[in-house]
């Protein structure tokens, strides 16, 4: 079928392939220090690493992309490592009317795949 | 707010930033010639191009990623160009019981963004 099994073992060696990694960032780093009050420091999970052939393919399109990249590397880019899902985070921030809590559903990655 | 407006004009020049591009592929290219009967050739829309700062940001996570990449380029990768939506395609293929039509919802990209 079109859905060849995506590979889950990294052929490039430990930590080289697409995975979730925690990055510490301050509100200053993000340019949010004037409107976000808390948390002052965020633990941001991000997707990093390479996407070798069929590794954690997001879908059929990603599998095709991987194959065509092998045939036409100048024309078709390799799949790249992006979030497959997110974990919500609540931020406390300034508003015109004072201070409020707001949930961000798309801020911190929870899983990664190659798309 | 966290949702800074994503940029829609490409600062790198025409055709350089993340966009949809048509790639011709035969069933042989895809390794599907033994089970897909039609079409013999596919027009595959793919997402190609670079993702400069805040260009077509998929969401808040992508905006953060762009910013942190500017601060820590060795640790945080730049956002990359991936499908934001797909257009379904029908393939005619062989099955154990003969020939059937099957819809693939995730085969051809319809839109792109930077994630």
């Amino acid at each position: 079928s079109a859905h060849a099994h995506p590979r889950d073992s990294c052929p490039l060696g430990p930590g080289r392939c697409c995975h979730l990694e925690t990055v510490q960032a301050t509100l200053e780093d993000l340019g949010w220090s004037d409107w976000v009050l808390s948390p002052r420091q965020l633990q941001l999970s991000m997707c990093v690493g390479e996407c070798p052939h069929l590794y954690r393919s997001a879908n059929t399109h990603a599998q095709i992309k991987a194959r065509l990249h092998g045939l036409q590397p100048d024309k078709v880019p390799a799949p790249c490592c992006v979030p497959s899902s997110y974990t919500p985070v609540v931020l406390m921030h300034r508003t015109d009317s004072g201070v409020s809590l707001q949930t961000y559903d798309d801020l911190v990655a929870r899983g990664c795949h190659c798309a | 707010s966290a949702h800074a407006h994503p940029r829609d004009s490409c600062p790198l020049g025409p055709g350089r930033c993340c966009h949809l591009e048509t790639v011709q592929a035969t069933l042989e290219d895809l390794g599907w010639s033994d089970w897909v009967l039609s079409p013999r050739q596919l027009q595959l829309s793919m997402c190609v191009g670079e993702c400069p700062h805040l260009y077509r940001s998929a969401n808040t996570h992508a905006q953060i990623k762009a910013r942190l990449h500017g601060l820590q380029p060795d640790k945080v990768p730049a956002p990359c160009c991936v499908p934001s939506s797909y257009t379904p395609v029908v393939l005619m293929h062989r099955t154990d019981s003969g020939v059937s039509l099957q819809t693939y919802d995730d085969l051809v990209a319809r839109g792109c963004h930077c994630a």
Epitope: L37, R40, V90, M92, R94, V99, L101 | -
Partner: antibody
Framework: QVQLVQSGAEVKKPGATVKVSCKAS????????MSWVRQAPGQGLEWMGY????????VYAQKLQGRVTMTTDTSTSTAYMELRSLRSDDTAVYYC?????????????WGQGTLVTVSS | DIQMTQSPSSVSASVGDRVTITCRAS??????LAWYQQKPGKAPKLLIY???SLQSGVPSRFSGSGSGTDFTLTISSLQPEDFATYYC?????????FGGGTKVEIK
Amino acid sequence: QVQLVQSGAEVKKPGATVKVSCKASGYTFDSLGMSWVRQAPGQGLEWMGYISTYSGDTVYAQKLQGRVTMTTDTSTSTAYMELRSLRSDDTAVYYCARESGQQVSALDPWGQGTLVTVSS
Amino acid sequence: DIQMTQSPSSVSASVGDRVTITCRASQGISRWLAWYQQKPGKAPKLLIYAASSLQSGVPSRFSGSGSGTDFTLTISSLQPEDFATYYCQQGASFPLTFGGGTKVEIK
């Protein structure tokens, strides 16, 4: 370890003002905000308000608006809660509670509590 | 304001029992629910945050679940030190609001 130590019990007359202090130790004081919660005798928990120890921004419960003021002194890592025009139904144990490092709107740890008795 | 309704208001149980406490929010709060334990004369102690995350140092017999409006705190095997009052608290919007509490008593 992280600790919040509150000032001692107070007895006040109706109409008076009380100021409760909460001294923090074991962490960077201005990195995490502080809420105040009270509990009337035999009753549940009532959130009073929040102060950002970093910026001084505050948000107060509607029913206490105009009577309560929350402040901080970063030089001594102390948060204060002042309640004015006291009434008998303000008799309660008052707690300071820091925002949790894991989730800004969860509270951990809590101070030991300060009993404020309003009686004529 | 978001109202938090806790049930039951009290429960009698024996050591070793499995105890379940529920909390319902008057509107969706995503997963922003915390659970606290309070013993007589003491300050509340955080057990669970973000609906299901166990606070550091809290025994694994405590667990939380749910999202949106319906949440549950479960004590898988009640220990003598678990007899206390338990409160839920929503953290999705100001004002922060607490449930009315559930007193877990010895049967």
